[in-house]
């Protein structure tokens, strides 16, 4: 069985302020089981943008229906983009663990840049 890969096809995305940004991410396998999360930035100070398991993320919607048992598409859309949202976004697969899930593999990242709102 081929090891799971996390694919973020776009290295960069540019969005006008006030619009929605779609950040694409796909897995090549469902195994190992465990949640996916999106972060802005890397390292200890990274900011959680979306957690498949839990939490309330009012500006984030998933592009695909994550309750499908065979879903491999973990793309997200972030609404009402502002300049403060600029940064590099990482789609990260975790494998289940106890008590805490363990980071398994990260995508290469997608840099989001924010253009000024057209006047």
């Amino acid at each position: 069985e081929d090891e799971l890969q996390v694919i973020q096809p776009e290295k960069s995305v540019s969005v006008a302020a006030g619009e929605s940004a779609t950040l694409r991410c796909a897995m090549t396998s469902l195994i190992p089981v465990g949640p996916i999360m999106w972060f802005r930035g890397a390292g200890a100070g990274r900011e959680l943008i979306y957690n498949q398991k839990e939490g309330h993320f009012p500006r984030v919607t998933t592009v695909s229906e994550l309750t499908k048992r065979n879903n491999l598409d973990f793309s997200i859309s972030i609404s009402n983009i502002t300049p403060a949202d600029a940064g590099t976004y990482y789609c990260v697969k975790f494998r289940k663990g106890s008590p805490d899930d363990v980071e398994f593999k990260s995508g290469a990242g997608t840099e989001l840049s924010v253009r000024a709102k057209p006047s």
Epitope: V33, T67, R69, N70, K96, S98
Partner: antibody, heavy 118, light 107 residues
Framework: DVQLVESGGGVVRPGESLRLSCAAS????????MSWVRQAPGKGLEWLAG????????YYIDSVKGRFTISRDNSKNSLYLQMNSLTAEDTAVYYC???????????WGLGTLVTVSS | ALTQPASVSANPGETVKITCSGG??????YGWYQQKSPGSAPVTVI????KRPSDIPSRFSGSASGSAATLTITGVRVEDEAVYYC???????????FGAGTTLTVL
């Protein structure tokens, strides 16, 4: 509070059909996958079928594939199980259950009894 | 198939462990369900291997390693008498499977 209430059970003859319903309240029904689980008299729990939140994807155990159909109407907060060609082995209490993000179960209904007898 | 003992017994206050084996750790999540009488509604005591719903007492805990999951009841009480079913969700097959159930008797 999350509530799941099954209905539609009863006594039917072998070969007949029955449609079970599950009315959901207390949560955003359209955001959750759902399942049907049954328990035959004196036996354990048996998962039968699951359906994604939007209703486009369905999953079954082999023993009911082709005879049972799971469906949902999110506008009515309702889950259904259409059961055809029933046999005595389908006699059981049928439960609907809400799925967690990883397709286990967190909330259960009280169940509805289906008896298949000639 | 998931395998669990048919019965376990304990005195009040003791610690009870119920095991459930047969799943692949990399592809399976486990849950535990309590049923106090046949035909009554099951109650989820653990899901996602070790997650306890907020209304379940803290004496219930779950863990998983290798090909097995364990339900632990620390300081068992008379009201914990029930049948406990383990269940697994397999991410390879998309199928849920239940164990045959373990009858817990509190002496």
């Amino acid at each position: 509070d999350v509530q799941l209430v099954e209905s539609g059970g009863g006594v039917v003859r072998p070969g007949e059909s029955l449609r079970l319903s599950c009315a959901a309240s207390g949560f955003t029904f359209s955001s959750y996958a759902m399942s049907w689980v049954r328990q035959a008299p004196g036996k354990g729990l048996e998962w039968l079928a699951g359906i994604s939140a939007g209703g486009s994807d369905t999953y079954y155990i082999d023993s009911v594939k082709g005879r049972f159909t799971i469906s949902r109407d999110n506008s009515k907060n309702s889950l259904y199980l259409q059961m055809n060609s029933l046999t005595a082995e389908d006699t059981a209490v049928y439960y609907c259950a809400r799925e967690t993000w990883n397709h286990l179960f967190d909330y259960w209904g009280l169940g509805t009894l289906v008896t298949v007898s000639s | 198939a998931l395998t669990q003992p048919a019965s376990v017994s304990a005195n009040p206050g003791e610690t009870v462990k119920i095991t459930c084996s047969g799943g692949d750790w990399y592809s399976t999540y486990y849950g535990w369900y309590q049923q106090k009488s046949p035909g009554s509604a099951p109650v989820t005591v653990i899901h996602s291997d070790d997650k306890r719903p907020s209304d379940i007492p803290s004496r219930f805990s779950g863990s998983a390693s290798g090909s097995a999951a364990t339900l632990t009841i620390t300081g068992v009480r008379v009201e914990d008498e029930a049948v406990y079913y383990c269940a697994g969700y397999d991410g390879r097959t998309y199928i849920n499977t239940f164990g045959a159930g373990t009858t817990l008797t509190v002496l």
